[in-house]
């Protein structure tokens, strides 16, 4: 009898109620391998999920996140809200990075500007909420009388926005 079940192809299941005949998977279910005794329920892409690939009798549906969200986890099992560059996501929504910190992604958290002086360098371009500082030559490398046009960036300490 086991041999009968092993003959059931993907897209079917071995129906014990019908003398182990191979029956097609019911609507909204699938079996991706042969010899299955049940079909699996199709994944539904709803809420913050949208359908990338419809379910078929032999393969599960695949989901993406709707616009304004990004995928996390295997097979996009989770969706997390996007923010703008220069922000981070908190429970109260997207918040601007604190002064001295930046985020160049639509996801993730703000992190401190690089402290150029720790490497003996000076600040060539100021940091913003969206971009890290750009470090230039060390002050000693500058021509006589020249000095850094901007003050050194704050030390790399974590920001303090509420999460």
């Amino acid at each position: 009898l086991q041999d009968l079940c092993s003959n059931c192809p993907a897209g079917t299941f071995c129906d014990n109620n019908r003398s182990q005949i191979c029956s097609p998977c019911p609507p909204n279910s699938f079996s991706s391998a042969g010899g299955q005794r049940t079909c699996d329920i199709c994944r539904q892409c709803k809420g913050v999920f949208k359908t990338r690939k419809e379910c078929s009798s032999t393969s599960n549906a695949e989901c993406d996140c709707i616009s304004g969200y990004h995928c996390l986890g295997a097979e996009c099992s989770m969706c997390e809200q996007d923010c703008k560059q220069g922000q981070e996501l908190t429970k109260k929504g997207c918040k601007d990075c604190c002064f001295g910190t930046f985020n160049d992604q639509k996801r993730g958290i703000c992190r401190p500007w690089t402290n150029c002086s720790l490497d003996g360098k000076s600040v060539l371009v100021n940091g913003t909420k969206e971009r890290d500082v750009v470090c230039g030559p060390s002050p000693a490398d500058l021509s006589p009388g020249a000095s850094s046009a901007t003050p050194p960036a704050p030390a790399r300490e974590p920001g303090h926005s509420p999460q």
């Epitope: 981070e88 993730g108 509420p162």
Partner: antibody, heavy 116, light 109 residues
């Protein structure tokens, strides 16, 4: 598909140094935080610290500050956890995980045993 | 540092509802996440951002979070739910993540 693959189990003596690794694949390694999590035998999960591989910015749990060093080499999509002088109390399973709050992918863990 | 406190163990009969609490000062101001860990395996997210369930996690898992307590609820608990459960949160103050001490869920019978 996204994977975090950790280096193999280590057996060390007290006072020795050690560096374990976590190699990411299947995603933009530089732009996602990597956290390290300790689990001592029969105990719970403890967050140790994290690194942003894009610029190697790190921050540590106060409990682990100065005890370990977290680093990364984005050119080979690998994060590291290292000790300069191991203690018997460092015996534990160490996991790397992607993320800073929601840890959506985990390595298989590296078992570190420190015994004289 | 925020500290998260969980009961060390919770027991439940099959088919009954299990509730696992996670207490911490004003944890409701931050997102709480829940992880399930079975012996010899890495943890898996079962609830994220207080109440969201990843796809592939059964509908019997749910979460809530307000005030000083986050709660993981498993309705109609099954034998396969026996595992260790950890709450976790991330706080922007110091940019730290923290796990609760963990709760061993035993499904009786």
């Amino acid at each position: 598909q996204v994977q975090l693959v950790q280096s193999g189990a280590e057996v060390k003596k007290p006072g020795e140094s050690l560096k374990i690794s976590c190699k990411g694949s299947g995603y933009s390694f530089s732009t996602y935080w990597i956290s390290w999590v300790r689990q001592m035998p029969g105990k719970g999960l403890e967050w140790m610290g994290k690194i942003y591989p894009g610029d190697s910015y790190t921050n540590y749990s106060p409990s682990f500050q100065g005890q370990v060093t977290i680093s990364a080499d984005k050119s080979i999509s690998t994060a590291y956890l290292q000790w300069s002088s191991l203690k018997a109390s460092d015996t534990a399973m160490y996991y790397c995980a992607r993320g800073y709050g929601i840890f959506d992918y985990w390595g298989q863990g590296t078992l570190v045993t420190v015994s004289s | 540092d925020i500290e998260l406190t969980q009961p060390p163990s919770v027991s439940v009969a099959p088919g009954q509802t299990a509730r696992i609490s996670c207490s911490g000062d004003n944890i409701g101001d931050q997102y709480a996440h829940w992880y399930q860990q079975k012996p010899g395996q890495a943890p898996v997210v079962v609830i994220y951002q207080d109440k969201n369930r990843p796809s592939g996690i059964p509908e019997r898992f749910s979460g809530s979070n307000s005030g000083n307590t986050a709660t993981l609820t498993i309705s109609g608990t099954q034998a396969e739910d026996e595992a260790d459960y950890y709450c976790a949160t991330y706080t922007g103050f110091g940019s730290l993540a923290v796990f609760g001490g963990g709760t061993k869920l035993t499904v009786l019978g």
